[in-house]
């Protein structure tokens, strides 16, 4: 049988640097992990000992850090042409900055094909755009050739901006004729490569003819075959196997995120393509894993204008952003105002025109804000002074939750209010009024939200049955500060922008600022 | 598509040698493994050995090791079994297989 | 050398009856098991491949399965050109190793 090794990344968030065990900034680097000179020193590890490999990413390096604020994808083409990755699929963050933010970084300087069957292009970006990226690639291996075959979310207008000349079919209905296309040219062996999430990786997998592996990306799977060796935990194990509607088993993959994992898959073919044994799992890039010294020496040659950049002025503030414990875990504060507002505003799509946008309503954790910003200092806001105030790396994400489950959230929010507890919540698109006097679980007596579906926006109560989306950090999406019923109710997430860069952007846009205090929280005693 | 394309019957005296052939195509032949299969009537299916083109190198059953020696012809993607010092035990039908599809055999008599 | 015990050597069915035939492994093999069909004439064709996917072309009454170390192969409505013989074959390991074979003969 013909043997291939399969090696994969996948929402690699512009983790260029090692980084620490939660994939924030690496610390103490004997305990860090991940970083482009670590993954090279492995693949070419595995390059030297076996003979047919590929590497391949399924998408979203970029957004995350500073490195993709200040070099805009410049970054991830050098270095993923450095480390000689052999195809990637484009994931939704690939078109935070625009299409234009796409095709001069990364397309037009990437050795290596960016694939995707289920974006069409339209208009004059058809011809811009016309070979930079492609629905397919077939690529010698030994001497067999392996198609890959590439998807990207479907929901990508909703969560990125990929701009009204680019259209976003199915993922299925659009990658089925490119297999067969493959199938004629006697290509028998086809990876669909791509980022879409784990159950349309599934899905893609059942119902896809022809397609022998599925290597996925978009909701940071993490699986793993006997004891993990870190802290994540597997969703399943690796290979997952699917039975396709044709009575086949396919291998469906996905390595975390961050590049703190590396997938390794073997494969085993017949001589009719067909697949005859899987088998792997993520390897942990951990300090035992020296970084390669030719890509670290390049990784701080590029560090020093992210240096040089993080004290640059980003905008001024002419008040003072109250970004205080002893108010943002009591109160409304500016900045969470301020947050908020910039994280509503990275999320304006004009998608549809019963929609002024697709998403009205923010929540964050007051815990989550760790500094204030001074405006004596001439007003001047910096990369630095925003890392003081959103130090953990996070991002914000979209989600879709029941107004019942809103309802629980803002209960939570004040459950014990007064003990200065990271759960109280910040908000925008949101009036909430609390009662304080009233027990536990019953002091949300007023909760207006913003409507979506309305040319002049306004406020009208919350529906307890009506599904909202919301943007909210990760850090609450996956339940934290308590949130417990966040994580369990959510009906879809979507990971977001990196935090620092949502409101550094909002900032530069606005140039000049001065959130107030304008009376979305408040209290009230008896009745309302 | 795959094919495995055996020589036709043979009928060998005993104490003689006799060389089948299996040519190969819709495929790499250098990468995968031709294996050898004897079935005689009665006695089930029997694995002889195998060889992989790409470098030439074999495995026997312990049982054929005497018996049997394979070769690959890698210009003409064509596999050969030679079976030496014939007896009326040899008679059989010889498959030659890969993992997916096999040769559709070839009849071997041995009988003075 | 990994054993193969085929059961049952022979069996009597009716045309559109479910029937099952079984290959006990001596040793771990995995999914590594082919399930192979002869015809009369003589030909082989493979039916399953890693113990349960299906070979292109191959009715969906065929299937494969796996519970510890015994692997099946079901039909789930007999057909007149089902009658013929059937075999499982490790490759896990060499030497490969062939089930006795189960001839499937006509009630």
């Known amino acids: 049988a013909w043997e291939l090794t399969i090696l994969h990344t996948n929402d690699v968030h512009s983790r260029l640097e090692q980084t620490s065990e939660d994939s924030s900034k690496c610390v103490n680097a004997s305990r860090c992990m991940g970083g482009v000179a670590r993954l090279f020193t492995k693949v070419q590890q595995i390059r030297r000992a076996e003979p047919n490999v590929l590497l391949l990413d399924a998408g979203d390096q970029y957004q995350g850090t500073i490195w993709f604020t200040v070099y805009k994808g410049a970054e991830v083409a050098h270095f993923m042409n450095a480390l000689r990755y052999d195809a990637m699929a484009l994931g939704n963050h690939e078109f935070d900055n625009g299409v234009e933010g796409l095709i001069e970084p990364l397309l037009k300087e990437a050795k290596f094909p960016i694939l995707s069957a289920n974006i069409k292009a339209k208009g004059p970006l058809a011809s811009q755009i016309s070979g930079l990226y492609l629905p397919y690639k077939v690529l010698p291996v030994g001497d067999e050739v392996v198609g890959i075959v590439g998807y990207t979310s479907k929901e990508t207008p909703f969560l990125s901006n990929p701009g009204t000349n680019l259209v976003f079919e199915d993922e299925i209905t659009a990658l089925q004729p490119e297999v067969d296309k493959l199938k004629t040219l006697n290509v028998n062996k086809i990876i669909a490569l791509g980022h879409s999430g784990f159950e349309m990786d599934k899905l893609i997998a059942q119902k896809v003819r022809g397609v022998d592996v599925v290597v996925g990306g978009h909701s940071n799977t993490f699986l793993y075959t006997g004891n993990p060796p870190s802290k994540e935990v597997p969703a399943g194990k690796y290979p997952f196997i699917v039975t396709s509607d044709d009575g086949r088993k396919v291998p469906v993959v996905q390595a975390y995120a961050f590049g703190k994992y590396l997938g390794y898959l073997k494969i085993e073919f017949d001589e009719r393509g067909n697949v005859i044994s899987s088998h792997g799992n993520p390897i942990l890039l951990n300090s035992s894993i020296p970084e390669d010294p030719s890509i670290k020496a390049d990784i701080n040659k590029w560090r020093i204008k992210l240096d040089n950049y993080s004290t640059q002025e980003l905008g001024k503030t002419i008040v003072y952003l109250d970004g205080s414990s002893q108010s943002c875990r009591f109160r409304e504060c500016n900045m969470g105002n301020l947050i908020c507002d910039a994280m509503i505003n990275n999320n304006l799509r004009h998608t549809d025109e019963m929609f002024w946008n697709h998403v009205s309503m923010c929540i964050l954790n007051g815990g989550g804000i760790r500094s204030p910003i001074d405006e004596r200092n001439n007003g001047t806001i910096t990369w630095e002074n925003l890392a003081a105030v959103l130090p953990f790396g996070g991002t914000f994400d979209l989600v879709q939750l029941k107004g019942s489950t809103l309802k629980k959230a803002f209960e939570h929010s004040v459950h014990r209010y007064g003990q200065s507890t990271g759960e109280f919540l910040q908000v925008g698109g949101i009036h909430v009024v609390y009662d304080l006097s009233r027990k536990p679980g019953d002091r949300v007596v007023k909760l207006d939200v913003l409507c979506t579906k309305c040319r002049v926006p306004s406020y009208d109560p919350l529906k307890m049955d009506e599904v909202y989306k919301v943007i909210l950090p990760n850090f609450l999406a996956n339940g934290g500060d308590g949130f417990q019923m966040i994580k369990d109710e959510l009906l879809r997430h979507d990971s977001g922008d990196q935090d620092i860069n949502v409101v550094s952007t909002y900032i530069s846009k606005m140039k000049v600022i001065y959130p107030a205090v304008e009376g979305r929280i408040k209290f009230s005693t008896g009745s309302h | 598509q795959v094919q495995l394309q055996q020589s036709g019957p043979e009928l060998v005296k005993p104490g003689a040698s006799v060389k089948i052939s299996c040519k190969a195509s819709g495929y790499i032949f250098t990468n995968y493994y031709i294996h050898w299969v004897k079935q005689r009537p009665g006695q089930g299916l029997e694995w002889i050995g195998w060889?992989?083109?790409?470098?030439?190198?074999?495995k026997y059953s312990e049982k054929f090791k005497d018996k049997a020696t394979l070769t690959a012809d890698t210009s003409s993607s064509t596999a050969y079994m030679q079976l030496s010092s014939l007896t009326s035990e040899d008679s059989a039908v010889y498959f030659c297989?890969?993992?997916?599809?096999w040769g559709q055999g070839t009849t071997l008599t041995v009988s003075s | 050398d990994i054993q193969m015990t085929q059961s049952p050597s022979s069996l009597s069915a009716s045309l559109g009856e479910r029937v099952s035939l079984t290959c006990r492994a001596s040793q771990d093999i995995g999914d590594r098991l082919i399930w192979l069909q002869q015809e009369p004439a003589g030909t082989f064709k493979r039916l399953i491949y890693?113990?349960?996917s299906l070979d292109s072309g191959v009715p969906k009454r065929f299937s494969g399965s796996r519970s510890g170390s015994d692997y099946s192969l079901t039909i789930s409505s007999l057909e007149s050109e089902d009658f013929v013989d059937y075999y499982c074959?490790?490759?896990?390991?060499?030497?490969?190793?062939f089930g006795g074979g189960t001839k499937l003969e006509i009630k």
């Open positions: 074959l490790q490759y896990a390991s060499s030497p490969w190793t």
């Open positions: 890693a113990t349960s």
């Open positions: 060889i992989f083109p790409g470098s030439g190198n074999t």
């Open positions: 297989a890969g993992l997916s599809d």
